[in-house]
């Protein structure tokens, strides 16, 4: 018979032969042969593999570093990685939660809609037309553009969501 060019699900092709993949939680020790099945071994303590695989090494569980404010939310198994979260009152910097911040800042062009609490992080909102923020802040709202008219001045440079308008003197008509 012709050697296979593709294999079924949960199999892999090696040496013109379809071998079974190792199940989640196990790593590959040796490929199958004409006479033997794929040999797999369970991952060790603090290791995991979360897919059907042909990996020869298991992945290390994530370490929730207390020096970064992290703690274990869910302990890893042979099939799943450890899930970290932040100490109470702190917030993850990303979905992967690799470090913690007290709260995040709103970038220039954004203002603070709601200051962080122990439960929720800072909520930012874009500065609408007529308002700006030129700083990164965890408490400052968007500021309204300066009104040149009330100062008897004219707009010399338009404002943006990150910059205030620039006012200047009105052109005096010559006699």
């Amino acid at each position: 018979p012709e050697p296979p060019t593709a294999c079924r699900e949960k199999q892999y092709l090696i040496n013109s032969q379809c071998c079974s993949l190792c199940q989640p939680g196990q790593k590959l020790v040796s490929d199958c042969t004409e006479f033997t099945e794929t040999e797999c071994l369970p991952c060790g303590e603090s290791e995991f593999l979360d897919t059907w695989n042909r990996e020869t090494h298991c992945h290390q569980h994530k370490y929730c570093d207390p020096n970064l404010g992290l703690r274990v939310q869910q302990k890893g198994t042979s099939e799943t990685d450890t899930i970290c979260t932040c100490e109470e009152g702190w917030h993850c910097t990303s979905e992967a939660c690799e470090s913690c911040v007290l709260h995040r800042s709103c970038s220039p062009g954004f203002g603070v809609k709601q200051i962080a609490t122990g439960v929720s992080d800072t909520i930012c909102e874009p500065c609408p037309v007529g308002f700006f923020s030129n700083v990164s802040s965890a408490f400052e709202k968007c500021h309204p553009w300066t009104s040149c008219e009330t100062k008897d001045l004219v707009v010399q440079q338009a404002g943006t969501n990150k910059t205030d308008v620039v006012c200047g003197p009105q052109d005096r008509l010559r006699a």
Epitope: W90, L102, V135, A138, F139
Partner: nanobody
């Protein structure tokens, strides 16, 4: 290495005053937004007060408004919190924090105890 060292805490009677300091080193202090955050025994973190990098804008939690004043002296790389009319509920460890507010910038804090 960024370091924030809080001082000025102590035992004070209700109605008394204290001035906390936060000495900053390892970074250019001027221009950084700074916060005072406190943690009462067995309670969560409470954001007390903040000051903008320029010193022109400030924020106060409702619980301290009219009693506490935040200020900064960029020439001394120091943040201050003047606390007047202290109450028992102000008892906490007070920490200062700098942007980007990472956990590894978090100092030991200074303990304020308000009791008669």
């Amino acid at each position: 290495e960024v370091q924030l060292l809080e001082s000025g805490g102590g035992l004070v009677q209700p109605g008394g005053s204290l001035r906390l300091s936060c000495a900053a080193s390892g970074f250019t202090f001027a221009g950084y937004e700074m916060w005072w955050v406190r943690q009462a025994p067995g309670k969560g973190l409470e954001r007390v007060s903040a000051i903008s990098g320029s010193g022109g804008s400030t924020y106060y939690a409702d619980s301290v408004k009219g009693r506490f004043t935040i200020s900064r002296d960029d020439s001394k790389n120091t943040l201050y919190l003047q606390m007047n009319s202290l109450r028992a509920e102000d008892t906490a460890v007070y920490h200062c924090a700098k942007e980007p507010y990472s956990y590894d910038y978090w100092g030991q804090g200074t303990l304020v105890t308000v009791s008669s």
